[in-house]
């Protein structure tokens, strides 16, 4: 018979013939041959694979190290890798969350759009005409105004993008 | 910085349980294994077992099965070996460790010295 | 269970002289780790996934090997070298250590 050109899934192809893949969680020691089966061996402790595959050595879990802010979200196991994330107050700074760095916060004048997680920074946001935010805050957002008229008085200082509005007693001279 | 601090030495009769502790710090015990092993005077080192402290998952050598008892306690970041019907021949230092790849050290406590004599 | 036999138990090296310490394992392992150890102390991993030295390790360490066999080396005998060397396989439960080897200076 013709030697086979392709493969079937799960299988690849080494000296002119198909040999089976090495399942998730283990790594290849020896190819098939025309009278063996592929040789597999499961990966160690603290070591994974996570697709099927040829490779002779498994990779190491991801070691989330604490002096960079990280710590883990996920345990790895021998088919999946260990996740980190970043410490309370913390996001990462890449996709691979490698390391972290402190959210920022929004200054006076801004508020916060977008509270930052583990993976993502703060989102701020210009407080509009009619809110305010008087701090530098990684958790708060813009607040309306006071109403004066809802307490029975009137503007006496105007608001601004970082003050809230000043009331003060109805003009009781007026007729 | 990553720490194992074991509990004190501990002389007992044979038949007696010893339990032993290794607090951590530096890290958060339940997102590595906890190893125990056991070093006998001038001889080399026995695994005993291993805890998960996330689930209590455990491994145990065969040798020491059905006398060893791992557990943790996630809250206070510790873990405890407890053996029981003590011979003479436990008389060793028992030591804890990591996950190898904690930090690339492998951090392992200081030892726990028990002494099994009547 | 997988055996794990360590030779030379005991030897003696001079100032300089290349050291090779093996480790043969009853059948294929994933990986092996070696610890050191001096007199009165707790281990240190010593060489972490075979080849890999573990933090604060001389360069004039490595590690090779793969299967059921593995070796560790020291380039070159330093005085500080002197003390007992531990392999250990994590790949099937029960997980377990070589005899040792102890390392002396010449």
């Known amino acids: 018979p013709e030697p086979p050109t392709a493969c079937r899934e799960k299988q690849y192809l080494i000296n002119s013939q198909c040999c089976s893949l090495c399942q998730p969680g283990q790594k290849l020691v020896s190819d098939c041959t025309e009278f063996t089966e592929t040789e597999c061996l499961p990966c160690g402790e603290s070591e994974f694979l996570d697709t099927w595959n040829r490779e002779t050595h498994c990779h190491q879990h991801k070691y989330c190290d604490p002096n960079l802010g990280l710590r883990v979200q996920q345990k790895g196991t021998s088919e999946t890798d260990t996740i980190c994330t970043c410490e309370e107050g913390w996001h990462c700074t890449s996709e691979a969350c490698e390391s972290c760095v402190l959210h920022r916060s929004c200054s006076p004048g801004f508020g916060v759009k977008q509270i930052a997680t583990g993976v993502s920074d703060t989102i701020c946001e210009p407080c509009p005409v009619g809110f305010f935010s008087n701090v530098s805050s990684a958790f708060e957002k813009c607040h309306p105004w006071t109403s004066c008229e809802t307490k029975d008085l009137v503007v006496q200082q105007a608001g601004t993008n970082k003050t809230d509005v000043v009331c003060g007693p109805q003009d009781r001279l007026r007729a | 910085e990553v720490q194992l601090v074991q509990s004190g030495a501990e002389v007992k009769k044979p038949g007696a349980t010893v339990k032993i502790s290794c607090k951590v710090s530096?890290?958060?015990?339940?997102?590595?294994?906890i190893h125990w092993v056991q070093q006998a005077p001038g001889k080399g080192l026995e695994w005993m077992g291993r805890i998960d402290p996330e689930d209590g998952d455990t491994k145990y050598d065969p040798k020491f099965q059905g006398r060893v008892t791992m557990t943790a306690d996630t809250s206070t970041d510790t873990a405890y070996m407890e053996l029981s019907s003590l011979r003479s021949e436990d008389t060793a230092v028992y030591y804890c460790?990591?996950?190898?790849?904690?930090?690339?050290?492998?951090?392992w406590g200081q030892g726990t010295t028990v002494t099994v004599s009547s | 269970q997988i055996v794990l036999t360590q030779s030379p138990t005991i030897m003696s090296a001079s100032p300089g002289e290349k050291v090779i310490i093996t480790c043969s394992a009853t059948?294929?392992?994933?990986?092996i780790l070696w610890f050191q150890q001096k007199p009165g102390t707790s281990p240190k991993l010593w060489i972490y996934s075979t080849s890999n030295l573990a933090s604060g390790v001389p360069a004039r360490f490595s590690g090779s090997g793969s299967g059921a066999s593995y070796s560790l080396t020291i380039s070159r005998m330093e005085a500080e070298d002197a003390a007992t060397y531990y392999c250990q396989q994590r790949t099937f439960y029960p997980y377990t250590f070589g005899g040792g080897t102890k390392l002396e200076i010449k």
């Open positions: 530096g890290f958060n015990i339940k997102d590595y294994y």
């Open positions: 059948s294929s392992v994933s990986y």
């Open positions: 460790t990591t996950s190898y790849y904690v930090g690339t050290y492998g951090y």
